[in-house]
Interface confidence: low
């Protein structure tokens, strides 16, 4: 299963498989997630250790039992890989680190006006992995506003130093935000030259390409097929790079296939997993387990569920079968790829789906119509669960927001359907940032079922919650993925970093905004909220958020949208935008439906016929 909790002041002892420098625990966790053998990690922030060499140390660990002894270490942070965590698996890391210089090979320097512009330059440079920016207050005048683009052999900094007035971060290419664009073509019978950065065995060129995409230094690849003339090189996938970023030469060569990394694709990246099953093929590797199962698909599921399993072979040899079940060999290797690929066998092989982010994994932890006043523009993929609920009568218009909580489920406010209960008039747009991008050709989801809370009454503020079942399930991408739900009975007191998003009015008597807006709003206790709304009952099933002085709030058109809070590196849906007295008024916080109080209802309504919850439920 998916384990998302972090252990503070704890360090896992032993089990080391790799180490590197990372700016924080979340980035360390991401590197662990993508490392083929890492199950656990420990991170040492600068404050946790005097040894300069170990500051910002990220230690990736493996353990056959899934656990390692934890020792107390003040300031250290430890946790689990997010393998098996479905939509939480992402190589995208947007954070900017102030007062930190991430060292590497500086290959480009330019003057820019902001750290955001520096990050954009890095994202638009094919070789840039991370960057550092010297602010206008940097102590050496000649370096001020310098944007240094960097790379390193492992894709992570070679060192991280605390340095005032320097800001650092990573390329947003893994967020599918590069302006470079990508080459989707696969070139048959063509071999690329240049520097080999790694060599793995793969069953086909598509697996080779995906591995290249997620390798820190691979820009293009050449794959040697299983009929390549040199036996020892069959199924070899060579991951390559060059100074220029493109192959300096290519040679026509029978039974080779070449192509490019897809990391520079805009809006969509391949999933970091390989779902295809290869009949008549055996994958060799270190044996993890052997179990009798019925069918190759069950074998793949078994491999996926056993977190250390990387790939499998399902044997149909008579001696490996009894009754309807045959042996499922669960295997692993140092690099996550088979150590041997054999053809013409009576087996079928494939990979674990533990890094797929489209899975219906049900574990996260890994939680008056009112718009956003006082907010700022959001960026692509920042709030991938946000949807726009639009009504098409004679014209089409945005009415409410909503939150994607599963492949086929959206959570919103019940009052959005006041007077508009017909599901046919609604269109749901997901994975969008600008409403003006919507044309008649833009795909949308239609509603299969609207489930309004049974105790909701029109024009009352209570139980303002509704579920929408979509006619067809949505695929998850960097721009369209669900938000985790809170644990049942979560107290809002743990949440300190909360945001409201929507396309609603930017002032009380305003209009719908084109670009999705975001605003950081603190939660307010129910007691405080009740004082501000003496004519209404603020119940325990509501949560309030707002500034005492006003100025920032949700408003008309934001209803049904998310109030999300980040805790221990994970976003959770804490509230549904519901109502308020005007917008952003002084001492009039926004009132939100408290999602944690409705977990039983959400789980009950989203149960499919097979009894499995089809949304992102809490761990």
């Amino acid at each position: 299963g998916c384990l998302t909790q972090l252990y503070e002041n704890a360090f896992f002892r032993g089990g080391d498989v790799a180490s590197m420098y990372t700016p924080n625990a979340q980035y360390c966790q991401m590197r662990c997630t993508f490392h083929p053998r890492c199950l656990l990690f420990s991170f040492l922030p600068a404050s946790s250790i005097n040894d300069m060499e170990k500051r910002f140390g990220c230690f990736l660990k493996d353990s056959v039992t899934g656990t390692l002894p934890k020792v107390h270490r003040t300031g250290a942070v430890s946790g689990h890989s997010l393998k098996q965590c479905g939509h939480q698996i992402s190589a995208c890391h947007r954070d900017i680190y102030k007062g930190v210089d991430m060292r590497g090979v500086n290959f480009n320097v330019s003057k820019v006006s902001s750290v955001e512009e520096c990050q954009k330059r890095c994202t638009s440079n094919i070789r840039c992995q991370f960057f550092s920016y010297a602010t206008q207050t940097f102590h050496k005048a000649e370096y001020r506003n310098n944007c240094l683009l960097k790379y390193s052999p492992g894709g992570t900094p070679t060192a991280i130093k605390v340095l005032s007035n320097v800001e650092s971060g990573f390329s947003l290419k893994p967020c599918a935000l590069s302006e470079i664009g990508c080459h989707m073509n696969i070139f048959q019978h063509l071999a690329f030259s240049d520097v080999d950065v790694a060599r793995v065995l793969t069953p086909d060129a598509f697996v080779c390409r995906t591995i290249c995409t997620y390798h820190p230094n691979c820009l293009f690849f050449t794959f040697y097929t299983n009929v390549w003339k040199i036996e020892s090189q069959r199924n070899v996938c060579l991951l390559k790079t060059s100074e220029s970023g493109t192959p300096s030469s290519s040679t026509p060569q029978e039974n080779t296939i070449s192509g490019y990394s897809l990391l520079t694709c805009k809006r969509t990246l391949p999933e970091p997993c390989h779902s295809k099953i290869y009949p008549g093929v055996d994958f060799g590797g270190e044996e993890l387990n052997v179990t009798f199962v019925k069918g190759v698909n069950v074998c793949q599921e078994t491999c996926t569920k056993m977190i250390r399993c990387q790939f499998f072979t399902y044997s149909l040899l008579p001696e490996d079968c009894k009754e309807e079940k045959c042996k499922c060999f669960l295997r692993l290797s140092m690099d996550g790829s088979p150590t041997r690929i054999a053809y013409g066998t009576q087996g079928s092989s494939g990979y674990s789906l533990r890094l797929c982010n489209t899975g219906d994994n049900s574990v996260c932890t890994t939680k008056t119509s009112t718009r956003i006043v006082g907010g700022t523009n959001s960026s692509w993929g920042e709030w991938p669960w946000q949807v726009s609920l639009q009504v098409k009568l004679t014209a089409q218009r945005h009415l409410c927001g909503g939150s994607l909580i599963g492949h086929q489920w959206v959570l919103t406010a019940a009052h959005c359907f006041d007077g508009l209960p017909l599901q046919d008039v609604w269109r749901i747009y997901s994975g969008i940032l600008n409403l003006s991008d919507i044309t008649k050709d833009t795909p949308f989801s239609q509603i299969k079922e609207i489930i309004i809370h049974q105790n909701y009454k029109v024009s009352e503020g209570n139980h303002d919650i509704a579920l929408i079942k979509l006619q067809a399930p949505l695929n998850y991408t960097e721009f369209q993925k669900p938000i985790c739900l809170p644990s049942k009975g979560d107290t809002s007191t743990i949440y300190t970093n909360c945001w409201v998003t929507g396309w609603g009015f930017s002032k009380e008597k305003g209009e719908i905004q084109n670009i999705l807006q975001k605003v950081n709003i603190p939660l307010v206790t129910n007691e405080e909220c009740q004082k501000r709304y003496q004519d209404y009952k603020i119940t325990q099933r509501m949560v309030c958020a707002g500034y005492k002085e006003g100025g920032k709030d949700a408003c008309k058109g934001d209803s049904g949208g998310p109030l999300v809070c980040k805790h221990n590196g994970m976003w959770r849906l804490v509230g549904i935008t519901s109502w308020g007295e005007g917008c952003a008024r002084r001492e009039q916080p926004g009132v939100y439906t408290k999602v944690a109080e409705y977990m039983d209802w959400i789980l009950e309504k989203t149960q499919s016929s097979d009894g499995k919850a089809q949304m992102q439920s809490p761990a």
Epitope: G14, L68, L330, A619
Partner: antibody
Framework: QVQLQQSGAELMRPGASVKVSCKAL????????MHWVKQTPVLGLEWIGA????????AYNQKFKGKAIFTADKSSRTAYMYLSSLTSEDSAVYYC??????????WGQGTLVTVSA | DIQMTQSPSSVSASVGDRVTITCKAS??????LAWYQQKPGQAPRLLIS???GLEAGVPSRFSGSGSGTDFTLTISSLQPEDVATYYC?????????FGQGTKVEIK
Amino acid sequence: QVQLQQSGAELMRPGASVKVSCKALGYTFTDYEMHWVKQTPVLGLEWIGAIHPGSGGTAYNQKFKGKAIFTADKSSRTAYMYLSSLTSEDSAVYYCTRPYGYPFAYWGQGTLVTVSA
Amino acid sequence: DIQMTQSPSSVSASVGDRVTITCKASEDIYNRLAWYQQKPGQAPRLLISGETGLEAGVPSRFSGSGSGTDFTLTISSLQPEDVATYYCQQYWSTPWTFGQGTKVEIK
């Protein structure tokens, strides 16, 4: 195939110490943790802790800290559990066990330790 | 520590009967649960684990279910060779803990 061979039964006096051994066969000894479990009629099965022979890392159940010490000898592929200051409450069958995936898939035959004056 | 409570402590049933043993954890163990069978004078034997289900070589009459804190081991049709004590064990957080055991006998 994987086998765990434990040392024979021990009859000990109160206050004495005992060393229980577990020889691992049929797999790479340094790749897998070795765990120890105590079984008594009253308390049933209790996890004592584990050692990773490759790294030497150990984990102990708080209840057995100061009572049990784990060591491992890579050359002889043998894990040891040293129990000190024995009392009648330490009378039990002790198992070494090795995980496969996560739970305990392989067990030794058990070593009966009897503490009696 | 997480407490594992098994019930019943013993059960007597006829050959062919369906036998159900329950195990309750004191907190959510995220499906990190294993079931073991122990026959007199022998070491425990792993039957079922939360990740992979039924272990290789374990008869299909054994099945496990449950989530969160409540788990069940079912023997769909009791056989004479199933006479043993059955234990559940959580491996969600150390110290790993076992249930107190359920003794299964033939009437």
